[in-house]
Interface confidence: medium
């Protein structure tokens, strides 16, 4: 168990022309707050999948009113951290969504008005117990600066918060500076001390004396960005003679820029130059947004939490497809029971029931024989959605009102002759045949 903590440092207009001055105005004062959603793993998860690791909402920030003519100050932010407790192991790799919300206070008709100003998303590797990691994300014209970390709640320890160390009530036999560790009472654990000089920002350790690097950093103390090296041949093999430290593959190896973007290395990482219609760190975000109204048939447009989707359409009942462009054939699910006919009216489903059945889905079997009478001693048999009469000998028809000629159906096989009799029929068989119907 532990807590993921998010600290928002600033939210405001990003660099470059066309950036908004402020999300609030003199006429409509507002306040900001943030919501974070966490999902485990780095997988390509659908935007609508739940925040399986948890979600948290910040307090609402101070009310801000823009002063016309005054320089735009930093927007006032809510106090405190956003904390997302997790009960199980910290997964190490996770996806996040951070939303910036605005609450307008000047328009009180029908209560306060909300709007989502920006949504950023990313996937990260993070060890619990490590230092704060800093990040900058851009969403449209807005820029969000934040730090995050995962920490274990006692008695959990370790990079996944899965090991338990709890003090025993009995006096400890461990030496000074050591703590008893469950489940082995005799095992003593030293407080985790990383290798001397290990970068507090870019390194962490799971064993005392080691220094493991976060993604993007290398070197014995995790102080060297992966894209720089003192070696003449930055891609060359490690050389024991020169003591040359070789970082991993270059950040542009394999071209991380999607959708035809071109990659160029920077001192700390890489930069993608995106073709028209795409943006994002890796040109992964399509230029189509909810502002373009991509959802048809009354679908609700929600900005995509996944970098591969700039928007998600949530379709009303009866429609499907990425833009709610396809009508669902709801009758294909055969919702009408007992042979009822399904009618999709668009706004609703209707079932036209066969005789003897009723209900919205023809689920009720009516008493077919109620109020029905069979003539001439016949008995009513219920079933199949309609009543049926089992008639006495010599009678037929739906209600046993017709005199029946038992020989009309030519029941005697192989040329046998049929004779009507009060008890039914009698077959006189042709030579060489026998049986009640001359069938043998």
């Amino acid at each position: 168990a532990g807590v993921f903590e998010l600290q928002i440092h600033s939210f405001g207009p990003g660099p470059g022309p066309g950036a908004p001055r402020s999300p609030c105005s003199a006429r409509l004062p507002c306040r900001l707050f943030f919501r974070v959603c966490l999902k485990p793993g780095l997988s390509e998860e659908a935007a609508e999948s739940p925040c399986a690791l948890g979600a948290a909402l910040s307090a609402r920030g101070p009310v801000y009113t823009e002063q016309p003519g005054a320089p735009a100050p930093d927007l006032p932010l809510p106090d405190g951290l956003l904390q997302v407790p997790f009960r199980d192991a910290w997964p190490g790799t996770f996806s996040f969504i951070i939303e910036t919300w605005r609450e307008e206070l000047g328009d009180q008709i029908g209560g306060p008005a909300w709007s989502l100003l920006a949504r950023v998303a990313g996937r990260r590797r993070l060890a619990a117990g490590g230092p704060w990691a800093r990040d900058i994300q851009r969403a449209g014209a807005w820029e969000l600066r934040f730090s995050y970390r995962a920490r274990c709640e006692p008695p959990a320890v370790g990079t996944a918060c899965t090991r338990l160390c709890r003090p025993r009530s009995a006096p400890s036999r461990c030496g000074p500076g050591l703590r008893p560790c469950a489940p082995l009472e005799d095992e003593c654990e030293a407080p985790l001390v990383c290798r001397a000089g290990c970068s507090p920002e870019h390194g962490f350790c799971e064993q005392p004396g080691e220094c493991r690097c976060l993604e993007g950093w290398t070197g014995p103390l995790c102080t060297v960005p992966v894209s720089t090296s003192s070696c003449l041949s930055p891609r060359g093999p490690s050389s024991a003679t020169t003591g040359c430290l070789v970082p991993g593959p270059g950040p542009c190896d394999g071209n991380p820029c999607a959708n035809g973007g071109s990659c160029s290395e920077t001192p700390r990482s890489f930069e993608c130059t995106c073709p028209r219609g795409f943006y994002g760190l890796r040109c992964e975000v399509s230029g189509v947004t909810c502002a373009d109204g991509p959802c048809f048939n009354g679908g609700l447009c929600v900005g995509g939490a996944d970098p591969d989707s700039a928007y998600i359409c949530h379709c009303p009942p009866g429609f499907q497809g990425s833009n709610c462009e396809k009508r669902v054939d709801r009758c294909s699910l055969q919702p009408c029971r007992n042979g009822g006919l399904c009618l999709d009216l668009g706004h609703a489903l209707r079932c036209r029931c066969r005789a003897g059945f009723a209900g919205p889905r023809c689920e009720h079997d009516l008493d077919d024989c109620a109020g029905r009478a069979c003539a001439n001693g016949g008995t009513c048999v219920e079933g199949g959605g309609a009543h049926r009469c089992s008639c006495a000998l010599g009678f037929g028809g739906r209600d046993c009102r017709e005199r029946a000629d038992p020989c009309a159906a030519r029941p005697c096989a192989h040329g046998g002759r049929c004779y009507a009799h009060f008890s039914g029929l009698v077959c006189a068989c042709a030579p060489g045949y026998m049986g009640a119907r001359c069938e043998f």
């Epitope: 948290a56 008005a113 909810c290 502002a291 939490a305």
Partner: nanobody, 129 residues
Framework: EVQLVESGGGSVQAGGSLRLSCAAS????????MGWFRQAPGKEREGVAT????????YYADSVRGRFTISQDNAKNTVYLQMNSLKPEDTAMYYC??????????????????????WGQGTQVTVSS
């Protein structure tokens, strides 16, 4: 597909209490808000209370503030409406709704029906004097 199922409605004397529950299945991330609305015969549907999922932010209509409390059990994906000091004018069909504002900056009101794209079938609350 999100499905919302309300329960807990019934008849009660003025001054009494009821607790409504709304269980959500197929609940999606886009449904940032869950709310309770009500509709009395011959009247428009009106917002009663709204809660933001993943946080405790709540909104109440003026007519119920101080008497009604909305809460959420994230583990059970259930939203509750505790109604105390009920009045005859609280008599209505109560609906649970889930939805979220658009992401293009358009205004959205937590206590108004537009923007709530998922609705339950409703549960009747009758308060007699």
């Amino acid at each position: 597909e999100v499905q919302l199922v309300e329960s807990g409605g019934g008849s009660v004397q003025a001054g009494g209490s009821l607790r409504l529950s709304c269980a959500a299945s197929g609940y999606t991330y886009s449904s940032n808000f869950m709310g309770w609305f009500r509709q009395a015969p011959g009247k428009e549907r009106e917002g009663v209370a709204t809660i933001v999922s993943g946080g405790g932010t709540t909104y109440y209509a003026d007519s119920v503030r101080g008497r009604f409390t909305i809460s959420q059990d994230n583990a059970k994906n259930t939203v509750y409406l505790q109604m105390n000091s009920l009045k005859p004018e609280d008599t209505a069909m109560y609906y649970c709704a889930a939805g979220g504002p658009p992401t293009n900056g358009a205004k959205w009101y937590p206590l108004r029906p537009p923007g709530y794209n998922y609705w339950g079938q409703g549960t009747q609350v009758t308060v007699s004097s």
